[in-house]
């Protein structure tokens, strides 16, 4: 602060920086003019004793003489662009002449106004009964401020020895509602935005599955509450799971669009078809009332049962050298659904019964021929197997002379023991 | 005598540039803020932004800023309104203006008590 | 922002007639009123300042009154010079924002 000023008689002064008081947001001036003889010195603004290096300031110097050294007047303006309670505060003018220091008398700068609101209610979605708290946050000058809270217009009893809450606890609703705070002070009222508070229905629990099958899944869940309003859908969401399913677990969006359907309530019930069998899924629900859908669930994991293979082993042949017979074939071209466990074969003549005999996952066997008959008309038929059970035969295949270059059997198969070498006693 | 002259108004495509001058005589730019106003065919007054010479501090509407640019350059005793990225919505008359906020130790508030004549853009 | 609205947005009168402007203001802007004057093709001229102190040069005919929220000008005996927009503009917070304008035209 500048102690050293003179504000007795010599002053330059003339005029003198008025009073300001006003609410935030406005725009003042104060002046000071003084007149001084020779050239005329730079006018400096302090506030509180503290230079204002900053000061948006103008000046103005107009001669009052013909000469430069005759009397000038300075008029120097603070403009205060946009008054804040820092703005507040005693302005002085200074200026420096001939090695002294001269101040006006002060001015002063009150900030004074209907409450100010630091902090307003925001909107938000709430699940239906669900506690939340909303804040609103005021100041003067003048202090102090009182707020006073209002839902639908209506305003709400303070809280017992809390005639000032900044947040509002609220228990819970059961229907969409409006709220905003009112700011007293001795100036007046502020009423500060109003807050739409949406009443969403809760987050559905117990989802589980009711039944599975290998193309098929039906699930079920128990809705949430949501208020006076009823549920009109819910909505499943069904993601194949694959190995990067971890990462994206804990966020809200699956890493590709999801399956989602959309089923009329009640029941709370969905049977999700066409499904590929023996496939790892996650499933979610959301359900949704007039004003919105909830949370959703967080996802669970689903797999489908494994099914039978779609289609037969390919390219079955059978082929007899002498008393053996090699058969052989691919696995099906169709899609398995499901671990292969292995194969099944089926072998039979025109006049002799079937035979059934589990390969394993072989892809070719070697039978013994033994008699001394040979049988009318043989065929072999194979199939693939899953837990689920057998997929289709394959056509059945008869039984073809060995040709000389279609290749020796293969002799590890071939002098595999039982069960993989078969006798025909019969022949 | 006080008076405000703009000029460097003219025709300019959208996404252009102008400069506005504003040369002030019989007072000192360095003592008063000066204000740009804009006036749209057949419409209304809009604020556009003000400088205050003395410090070279300048405020501008929302409409404006980070386009346009007000200086000042007190040796001249002339004012200047920079215009960048040109709008179609930016066409009007530009007025300079020098502020006036009445006499005594402090005022609320300002008017304008001097215009130029205008310049159309 | 705060709104200047004027009221009328037109009025017809005759010569020797007491015309009255209104502008109402969409929040407090204490006295930081000003009324302006405009003819077609010409700049603004500054009537009232501090929402009722006479400009220099300004007929006495011309007066402003208000505080607050609501403002008044008067022309207490239209003379025909007088036919012309008129503007209110509030100084009071930044950005300074002006009435949509009245128009003053011969009945």
């Known amino acids: 602060a500048h102690k050293d000023t003179q504000t007795e008689a010599g002053s330059p002064f003339v005029g003198n920086p008025g009073n300001i008081t006003g609410a935030r947001g406005l725009t003042g001036t104060l002046r000071c003019e003084l007149q001084v003889q020779g050239e005329p010195p730079e006018v400096v603004w302090l506030r509180d004793g503290q230079i204002l290096e900053l000061a948006d300031n103008t000046q103005t110097q107009v001669p009052l003489g013909e000469d430069w050294q005759d009397e000038w007047k300075v008029v120097s303006q603070l403009r205060i662009s946009a008054l804040q309670l820092s703005d507040a505060g005693e302005y002085q003018c200074m200026v420096h002449l001939e090695g002294r220091t001269f101040v006006s008398q002060p001015g002063f700068v009150g900030l004074e106004g209907l409450p100010y609101f630091l902090e307003e209610p925001e909107d938000k979605a709430v699940p239906a009964n669900t506690p939340f708290n909303l804040s609103c946050q005021a100041q003067g000058p003048p202090e102090p401020v009182t707020l006073l809270w209002l839902q639908d217009a209506v305003p709400l009893a303070p809280v017992t020895g809390h005639s000032s809450q900044h947040s509002l606890q609220t228990p819970g609703l059961n229907k969409t509602s409006s709220f905003s705070c009112e700011a007293h002070n001795a100036k007046g009222v502020t009423t500060s935005r109003t807050a739409t508070i949406t009443v969403l229905p809760q987050r559905p629990h117990h989802l589980h599955v009711v039944s599975r099958q290998p193309t098929e899944l039906e699930v079920a869940w128990t809705p949430g509450l949501s208020g006076i309003y009823p549920l009109t859908h819910c909505n499943l969401q069904a993601v194949l799971s694959d190995d990067g399913v971890g990462i994206w677990l804990g966020k809200s969006d699956p890493p590709e669009d999801p399956l989602t359907l959309q089923v009329s309530v009640p029941p709370h019930q969905l049977r999700l078809e066409k499904l590929l069998p023996h496939t790892p899924y996650h499933i979610r629900i959301s359900c949704s009332s007039s004003q919105g859908p909830s949370p959703w669930t967080h996802w669970l994991p689903v797999e489908t049962t494994e099914g039978v293979p779609l289609g037969p082993p390919e390219n079955v042949s059978a082929m007899r050298n002498g008393s053996q017979v090699l058969v052989r074939w691919q696995e099906p071209r169709v899609p398995l659904q499901g671990t292969l466990l292995g194969y099944r074969l089926a072998y039979r003549g025109q006049d002799t019964p079937e035979v059934l005999m589990d390969i394993g996952l072989t892809r070719e066997v070697t039978l013994e021929l033994r008699g001394d008959r040979p049988v009318a008309n043989l065929t072999v038929s194979v199939t693939a197997y899953t837990s689920a059970g057998d997929g289709p035969w394959s056509l059945p295949v008869p039984l073809e002379p060995w040709r000389p270059g279609q290749g020796q059997p293969l002799h590890h198969l071939v002098s595999e023991p039982p069960p993989r070498a078969f006798s025909w006693p019969w022949w | 005598e006080v008076q405000l002259v703009e000029s460097g108004g003219g025709l300019v495509q959208p996404g252009g540039s102008l400069r506005l001058s504003c040369a002030a005589s019989?007072?000192?730019?360095?003592?008063?803020?000066i204000h740009w106003v804009r006036q749209a065919p057949g419409k209304g007054l809009e604020w556009v932004g003000w400088i205050n010479p003395y410090r070279g501090y300048a405020y501008y509407a929302d409409s404006v800023k980070g386009r346009f640019t007000i200086s000042a350059d007190t040796s001249k005793n002339t004012a200047y309104l920079q215009m960048n990225s040109l709008r179609a919505e930016d066409t009007a008359v530009y007025y300079c203006a020098r502020e006036y906020s009445g006499w005594g130790g402090s005022s609320v508030g300002y008017a304008m008590d001097y215009w130029g004549q205008g310049t159309l853009v | 922002d705060i709104q200047m609205t004027q009221s009328p947005s037109s009025l017809s009168a005759s010569v020797g007639d007491r015309v009255t402007i209104t502008c109402r203001a969409s929040q407090d802007v204490s006295t930081a009123v000003a009324w302006y004057q405009q003819k077609p093709g010409k700049a603004p001229k500054l009537l009232i300042y501090?929402?009722?102190f006479l400009y220099s040069g300004v007929p006495s005919r011309f007066s402003g009154s208000g505080s607050g929220t609501d403002f008044t000008l008067t022309i207490s005996s239209l003379q025909p010079e007088d036919f012309a927009t008129y503007y209110c503009?509030?100084?009071?917070?930044?950005?300074?924002?002006f009435g949509q304008g009245t128009k003053v035209e011969i009945k």
């Open positions: 503009q509030q100084s009071y917070t930044t950005p300074p924002t």
């Open positions: 019989g007072f000192s730019l360095s003592g008063s803020w």
């Open positions: 501090s929402a009722s």
